[in-house]
C-alpha cells in the first residue's frame, strides 16, 4: 500500500543564465528508495542510484549537476528550460512516487520563487 507523499519545490522561477535547485522529498513511508530519476517532459536528465550513485545524461552533462542530496541543480538556464520537471522515486515495495515541479525561466532580473506544495 502506497502511503508516502512527495514534497517538491513546486512552481519556481529563475533568471536566464542563472541556476536553480530542483528538490523532492519523499516522506510518510517505510519503503526503501532504490533509485530516483529526474525527467524533463519525456527526457531523462539524471539518475541517482542507491548503489551506483549519479548518472547524468550525456546531452545534459554541461548544465546539470547532481545534488544537493537527491536533488538536481540546473545551470546556465535558458528560456527553453521552461517547463515541467519530474522526480520519480523507485521504492520497494511501494512502487513509484512522482513529484512535479514547474520551472519558468525569465528574461527579467526579477524571479520570484513559488511556495512549496505537496503531491500525494
Amino acid at each position: 500500500m502506497m502511503t508516502g507523499t512527495i514534497e517538491t519545490t513546486g512552481n519556481i522561477s529563475a533568471e536566464k543564465g542563472g541556476s536553480i535547485i530542483l528538490q523532492c522529498h519523499l516522506s510518510s513511508t517505510t519503503a526503501q528508495v532504490t533509485q530516483v530519476n529526474w525527467e524533463q517532459q519525456d527526457q531523462l536528465l539524471a539518475i541517482c542510484n542507491a548503489d551506483l550513485g549519479w548518472h547524468i545524461s550525456p546531452s545534459f552533462k554541461d548544465r546539470v549537476a547532481p545534488g544537493p542530496g537527491l536533488g538536481l541543480t540546473l545551470q546556465s538556464l535558458t528560456v527553453n528550460d521552461t517547463g515541467e520537471y519530474f522526480c520519480i522515486y523507485h521504492t520497494y515495495p511501494d512502487g513509484t512516487y512522482t513529484g512535479r515541479i514547474f520551472l519558468e525561466v525569465l528574461e527579467s532580473s526579477v524571479a520570484e520563487h513559488g511556495a512549496r506544495f505537496q503531491i500525494p
Partner: antibody
Framework: QVQLVQSGSELKKPGASVKVSCKAS????????MNWVRQAPGQGLEWMGW????????TYAQGFTGRFVFSLDTSVSTAYLQISSLKAEDTAVYYC???????????????WGQGTLVTVSS | DIQLTQSPSFLSASVGDRVTITCRAS??????LAWYQQKPGKAPKLLIY???TLQSGVPSRFSGSGSGTEFTLTISSLQPEDFATYYC????????FGGGTKVEIK
C-alpha cells in the same frame, strides 16, 4: 561475488527462541532491501516480510507479527531473524533474500541465502 | 493481498519436451512478476523478472510472457537439470508466491 551466507541449522524446544543470521558480501549491504521467506517441510514459499537496510525499519507480513523480529547490524553487513516462543509449526527452512534491481520493473529476489533449518521439537 | 494461482501443480514430462506453466494473479500486476526454480534441499534461483526478462546466466530455453493477470513460463526443450519445482512471484504490492509447479520425470 555477491552472496548471502546464513547460520547453521537449529534444534529448539517449544517455548525457546532462535536467532538466524544472514551475512551479505560482495555488494553494498545498505543499498538493497532484505526479505525473509519461510518454507515449511514439503510446502511452498511464504513471504514473511522485509527490512529496510537503510533505516533498519522492519515490515511484517500477516501472520508474522508478534513473535518475529527482523534486525540489522550494518557494521558487519548482517540481517537477523529472531523467533521467540517457538512452536512446532515454526519448523521450517528460513531464507533471507535480497531485492535486486534498481527500478520497480526490475525488482526480484536475485540473491538468496542457502537457508537455515529450524526444527522445533520436544 | 494479491493471490497467485499456478497450474498445473504437478507436471510429468520427458527430456526434450516443451513445458508451459501458467500463473494467474487475482488482480492486475502489470509486468511485476518473477519466476524461480527450486531443487530439493536448495534455495530458490531467480530465472525471470519483469515477466519476460531472463536473469543473467539463465539458459535461453527458459522464457516468460504475459502481463496483467495471466503469465506463462516456458521451457522450450526440457533438460535433465530442469526437473525441479517452479514458483511465480508478484512484486506489484507486498510480495506473494504462487503455490508451485513440480516438474517430474515421466
Amino acid at each position: 561475488q555477491v552472496q548471502l551466507v546464513q547460520s547453521g541449522s537449529e534444534l529448539k524446544k517449544p517455548g525457546a527462541s532462535v536467532k538466524v543470521s544472514c551475512k551479505a558480501s560482495g555488494y553494498t549491504f545498505t543499498s538493497y532491501p532484505m526479505n525473509w521467506v519461510r518454507q515449511a517441510p514439503g510446502q511452498g514459499l511464504e513471504w514473511m516480510g522485509w527490512i529496510n537496510t537503510n533505516t533498519g525499519n522492519p515490515t511484517y507480513a500477516q501472520g508474522f507479527t508478534g513473535r518475529f523480529v527482523f534486525s540489522l547490524d550494518t557494521s558487519v553487513s548482517t540481517a537477523y531473524l529472531q523467533i521467540s516462543s517457538l512452536k512446532a509449526e515454526d519448523t521450517a527452512v528460513y531464507y533471507c533474500a535480497r531485492v535486486g534491481g534498481y527500478s520497480v520493473d526490475e525488482y526480484a529476489f536475485d540473491v538468496w541465502g542457502q537457508g537455515t533449518l529450524v526444527t522445533v521439537s520436544s | 493481498d494479491i493471490q497467485l494461482t499456478q497450474s498445473p501443480s504437478f507436471l510429468s514430462a520427458s527430456v526434450g519436451d516443451r513445458v508451459t506453466i501458467t500463473c494467474r494473479a487475482s488482480q492486475g500486476i502489470s509486468s511485476y512478476l518473477a519466476w524461480y526454480q527450486q531443487k530439493p534441499g536448495k534455495a530458490p534461483k531467480l530465472l525471470i523478472y519483469a515477466a519476460s526478462t531472463l536473469q543473467s546466466g539463465v539458459p535461453s530455453r527458459f522464457s516468460g510472457s504475459g502481463s496483467g493477470t495471466e503469465f506463462t513460463l516456458t521451457i522450450s526443450s526440457l533438460q535433465p537439470e530442469d526437473f525441479a519445482t517452479y514458483y511465480c512471484q508478484q512484486l506489484s504490492s507486498y510480495p506473494t508466491f504462487g503455490g508451485g509447479t513440480k516438474v517430474e520425470i515421466k
